[in-house]
Interface confidence: medium
């Protein structure tokens, strides 16, 4: 008869930029209406109320109004809580309280976590390296939560733990930016790797620099930009880095600097006239305007869309010209996948069941793979659709039919080829007869 | 008849614990959830402890939390509130209250029992 | 914790007055307030719950409004055995529910 108030054990890791859903449900007694039900959803430590339901009908967000409840889902027990655009300030507990005649509460955990981008790598000295030279390798990535793990080591994969000196620092959105310094003396040449783990995402992100010294020639304006494409989480802000050689003696007046997209060389942001000429890509662009006079020419585009993906050309002339192009690709983390049942009640071994595999919000599309208990692959009779929304982030469904066995576990797993993220859900069918979702 | 009947007050020397109790009867006491309020002489009336039905949660005031705590006893239809470090502030009487559907508020109250903190 | 604050906190009133007692939450409560009366030596008996409900066996002169912060309770033509204390209650959040301060009411 108690009122069972029913979360997550463990943290619900959403990525920043991204919605996520504290999952609480609880059990309405038969004959129960929303006209009896006090829905409050609070920060645990403070009591600041987040989000309510009362009076029969959704009170609606008191936190920054990105908050919802699912309201056709609330009569079945569902009293989760839907937080959008997930910022780095909302980490911590949250208390769901549900008050009938009875009341229970529980509390659940936002873990909030955002991927290191790749890092790049400077030089410096980075001109006429001579063997026996001390070079500082610097090697910086940006916009990551919590804060990373930097490791380094040489092209045999030995560690590299002397000398080195990591900084981070959070930004106003609480995202850190990690610069990791290694002072190393340069032999005949060199493979030097940096390796930035965010501990939550359990995501390495690692770049490498092969020095091989010599003479390189001189008076040319080198763009260069990341040879690997610049993934970019939908909500969220990435860098599009570009960095050019100045001469000596060089000033910003000297500078055209111009962004542009590559195929259509639709104009994108520019600096010219020893000023930042701003944005003309629905002003969500921005320069490092600090950073230009020692050739960083980055870009930095807020609140990435789908929309967003392909090529940006850095064009930079100052008495001479180059430019490079470098790659945007956008990935949005698949939600874990939801697993329905039809029929789903009175199984019999020998049954033909259904079980789909859904799974939301997603991009690019994603790969499904399903599997038995003992993990071998099902690819008979699987049906897999994906359809884009208007933002043209992918919902994954995909259909596995099935004859039962005396009892069986069927797994689905949702896997992003960008972000390399796999997503999966499993059901497990046991006894005769029996009914789906198990009851308490 | 739904009945709440409160004992366990008396006189206790600061510092020093007591258990009150109250049991239930003329309705089914697991089903619901159940409050302590108390009343100071004099005073207005203050909340100090709730509990679901189930005992799994738990609330208190503030001047209450870490020396007081509320339990029951859905077999033997008893609610209790264990009391210790008491303060002369804790001088009261102690109502036993079983809440309703929340937005009914508190229809049936005990009789209290009167706590006494005083060396 | 939400803060009830009642007004007045005592009253002179004659029999076949009309009576009014308010009570400010401070914050929004939706409508989840219940009002008591209490005479001394008694525990306190509810009146009104979710703002506006008359309890069974309350009698029709008492009457609850209110939405929001604001609440009121009213008596329409006082009654010799109306006089008592009277309070308000909040159930809305989490516990401790808390009380308004009392109002007193008195004989004129």
């Known amino acids: 008869g108690a009122l069972e108030v029913q979360v997550p054990e463990d943290p619900v890791v959403a990525l920043v930029g991204t919605d996520a859903t504290l999952c609480c449900s609880f059990s309405p007694e038969p004959g129960f209406s929303l006209a009896q039900l006090n829905l409050i959803w609070q920060l645990t430590d403070t009591k600041q109320l987040v989000h309510s339901f009362a009076e029969g009908q959704d009170q609606g967000s008191a936190y920054a109004n990105r908050t919802a409840l699912f309201p056709d889902l609330l009569a079945q027990g569902n009293a989760s809580l839907r937080l959008q655009r997930v910022r780095v300030a909302d980490e911590g507990s949250f208390t769901c309280f549900v008050s009938i005649r009875d009341f229970g509460s529980a509390a659940v955990s936002l873990q909030v976590a955002a991927p290191y981008s790749k890092p790049s790598m400077t030089l410096e000295p980075n001109k006429d390296l001579r063997p026996g030279d001390t070079v500082t390798i610097t090697c910086s990535s940006y916009q990551g939560y919590p804060e990373a793990e930097v490791f380094w080591q040489d092209g045999q994969g030995v560690p590299l733990t002397g000398n080195v000196t990591t900084s981070q620092m959070a930004n106003e959105q609480g995202l850190f930016d990690v610069h990791s310094i290694l002072r190393v003396v340069l032999g005949a040449n060199g493979t030097y790797s940096c390796l930035v783990r965010n501990p939550v995402l359990q995501q390495d992100a690692h770049s490498s620099v092969t020095i091989t010294p010599q003479r390189s020639p001189t008076g040319a304006v080198e763009v260069q930009v990341p040879e690997d494409p610049v993934v970019a989480l939908v909500g969220t802000d990435a860098t599009l880095r570009c960095s050019f050689s100045p001469e000596p003696g060089f000033s910003l007046a000297q500078l055209n600097l111009i962004w542009q997209l590559t195929d259509t060389k639709q104009l994108v942001h520019s600096f010219t006239e020893g000023r930042d000429q701003g944005s003309a890509y629905a002003n969500r662009t921005a320069l490092f305007p600090d950073l230009l006079a020692q050739g960083n020419a980055s870009l930095r585009l807020q609140r990435v869309r789908v929309a967003d993906e392909g090529s940006f050309t850095c064009f930079v002339s100052i008495r001479d010209f180059g430019s490079a192009a470098v790659s945007l690709q956008v990935a949005a983390p698949y939600s874990k996948p939801s697993m329905t049942l039809e029929p789903n009640k009175d199984l019999r071994p020998g049954d033909t069941v259904t079980i789909t595999c859904s799974s939301y919000r997603g991009y690019p599309e994603a790969e499904v793979f399903w599997q038995d208990g003992q993990g071998v692959p099902l690819t008979g009779n699987v049906t897999t659709s994906q359809m884009a929304n208007e933002q043209g982030l992918f919902d994954v469904h995909s259909v596995l039919r099935v004859v039962l066995g005396a009892n069986g576990t069927y797994s689905c797993l949702v896997r992003n080829p960008v972000l390399q993220q796999d997503a999966h859900g499993s059901v497990t069918i046991t006894g005769q007869p029996m009914t789906f979702p198990p009851e308490a | 008849e739904v009945q709440l009947v409160e004992s366990g007050g008396g006189l206790v020397q600061p510092g020093g614990s007591l258990r009150l109790s109250c049991a239930a009867s003329?309705?089914?006491?697991?089903?619901?959830?159940m409050s302590w309020v108390r009343q100071a002489p004099g005073k207005g009336l203050e909340l100090v402890a709730a509990?679901?039905?189930?005992?799994?949660?738990?609330y208190y005031a503030d001047s209450v939390k870490g020396r007081f705590t509320i339990s029951r006893d859905n077999a033997k239809n008893t609610l209790y509130l264990q009391m210790s470090s008491l303060r002369a502030e804790d001088t009261a009487v102690y109502y036993c209250?079983?809440?309703?559907?929340?937005?009914?508020?508190?229809?049936?109250w005990g009789q209290g029992t009167l706590v006494t903190v005083s060396s | 914790d939400i803060q009830m604050t009642q007004s007045p906190s005592s009253l002179s009133a004659s029999v076949g007055d009309r009576v009014t007692i308010t009570c400010r939450a401070s914050?929004?409560?939706?409508?989840?307030l219940a009002w008591y009366q209490q005479k001394p030596g008694k525990a306190p008996k509810l009146l009104i719950y979710?703002?506006?409900n008359l309890q069974s066996g309350v009698p029709s002169r008492f009457s609850g409004s209110g939405s929001g912060t604001d609440y009121t309770l009213t008596i329409s033509s006082l009654q010799p055995e109306d006089f008592a204390t009277y309070y308000c209650?909040?159930?809305?959040?989490?516990?401790?529910?808390?009380f308004g301060q009392g109002t007193k009411l008195e004989i004129k």
């Open positions: 209650q909040h159930f809305w959040g989490t516990p401790p529910w808390t």
């Open positions: 914050e929004n409560i939706y409508s989840n």
């Open positions: 209250t079983r809440n309703e559907e929340f937005r009914r508020g508190l229809a049936y």
């Open positions: 979710a703002a506006s």
């Open positions: 509990i679901n039905s189930n005992g799994g949660s738990t």
């Open positions: 003329g309705f089914t006491f697991s089903s619901y959830a």
